[in-house]
């Protein structure tokens, strides 16, 4: 019987010879659970596992803890891969995180973190980041040190308010912090002075809601 080949991430897919962008099935080692992820095989050498994408407002990102845990949306379009999968993956080896951003004026920028991982669900999928470079700000728009993940039904932020309800979307909110890539999607010419938009403060400033975002990870030794 032919052995089934499985891939833990898009870097393994790439190294196996599949070098075309698209949706691939990923499976963690010692697991039977599969997830569908979009693989970017072109940008910066390829092998990137897309863990979040916003592009047109077609998917509702005001979701529950469980939905953010297991993932939602369409891997070919807007989606969230899932905190549990990303947590397990990023605790097995060292990963880098690249966040690619687009504004409504045709500009693009990125933030690259040389080390990224999420804590377990017991620790509320707290984000850990180190070593920022890139063009989307010299200061991290994800608050440092990293915060716990919060959703509309799980308030783990540092605010007297409930950030996820106030800003919408699940995120590593502080109180509430300089970013929220899972906020409300606003169309062009309606994207400024927004209290709950798609925010990356140290690139576009306050109240500016972005046109597009992609969060992608890849092993540091790729």
């Amino acid at each position: 019987k032919e052995e089934q080949i499985s891939f833990r991430d898009c870097a393994e897919v790439f190294k196996s010879g599949h070098t075309t962008n698209g949706v691939y099935t990923l499976t963690l080692p010692n697991s039977t659970e599969e997830v569908k992820a979009y693989c970017d095989m072109e940008a910066g050498g390829g092998g990137w596992t897309i863990i979040q994408r916003r592009e047109d407002g077609s998917v509702d990102f005001q979701r529950t803890w469980k939905e953010y845990k297991v993932g939602f949306g369409n891997p070919s379009g807007e989606y969230w891969l899932g905190n549990e999968f990303v947590s397990q993956l990023t605790n097995q080896q060292r990963y880098v995180l690249k966040i690619h951003l687009k504004d409504w004026e045709g500009n693009e920028a990125y933030s690259l973190y040389e080390h990224f991982y999420l804590s377990s669900e017991e620790l509320n999928y707290r984000i850990h980041l180190k070593g920022l470079t890139g063009t989307a700000g010299k200061i991290s728009s994800i608050s440092q040190p990293g915060n716990d993940f919060s959703t509309k039904d799980a308030d783990n932020d540092k605010c007297i308010c409930k950030c996820s309800q106030m800003l919408t979307g699940g995120w590593w909110f502080d109180a509430c912090g300089p970013s929220n890539l899972n906020g409300m999607y606003y169309p062009q010419r309606q994207n400024t002075n927004k209290f709950n938009g798609i925010k990356w403060y140290y690139w576009k400033g306050s109240g500016y809601s972005l046109k597009g975002t992609t969060m992608m990870i890849r092993p540091a030794d790729f």
Epitope: I160, M166, D174, N193, G207
Partner: nanobody, 129 residues
Framework: EVQLVESGGGLVQPGGSLRLSCAAS????????IGWFRQAPGKEREGVSA????????YYADSVKGRFTISSDNSKNTVYLQMNSLRPEDTAVYYC??????????????????????WGQGTLVTVSS
């Protein structure tokens, strides 16, 4: 649509006074804090004063304490900054900005700059003889 419109800037001699207004629309002041900020040429934007809770809580930067007074008229959805004893170093573009009042860190009284998501276009204040 959220809008903030500043007015009242102008040229004034050292020691003089001005009153700036910030008219808000698209939301009510009851649930928001309003901050005044200023930016001089070649310098970072800095916080000057802020108000929330219908005037129950106010903040002033050390550089303007005793000279500037912030107030609000919720019936007009407008916040004012009365500036007395003006100095040349007060010359700057003055902006007002809004943040949901509840967006406060536990134990803190005021808000980092990045929490203010709605901004006006600014009004120029020039203090010169």
């Amino acid at each position: 649509e959220v809008q903030l419109v500043e007015s009242g800037g102008g040229l004034v001699q050292p020691g003089g006074s001005l009153r700036l207004s910030c008219a808000a629309s698209g939301f009510t002041l009851d649930d928001y804090a309003i901050g005044w900020f200023r930016q001089a040429p070649g310098k970072e934007r800095e916080g000057v004063s802020a108000i929330r809770d219908n005037g129950g809580s106010t903040y002033y930067a050390d550089s303007v304490k005793g000279r500037f007074t912030i107030s609000s008229d919720n019936s007009k959805n407008t916040v004012y900054l009365q500036m007395n004893s003006l100095r040349p170093e007060d010359t700057a573009v003055y902006y007002c900005a809004a943040v949901p009042a509840g967006r406060l860190r536990f134990g803190e009284q005021w808000y980092p700059l990045y929490e203010y998501d709605a901004w006006g276009q600014g009004t120029l204040v020039t203090v010169s003889s």
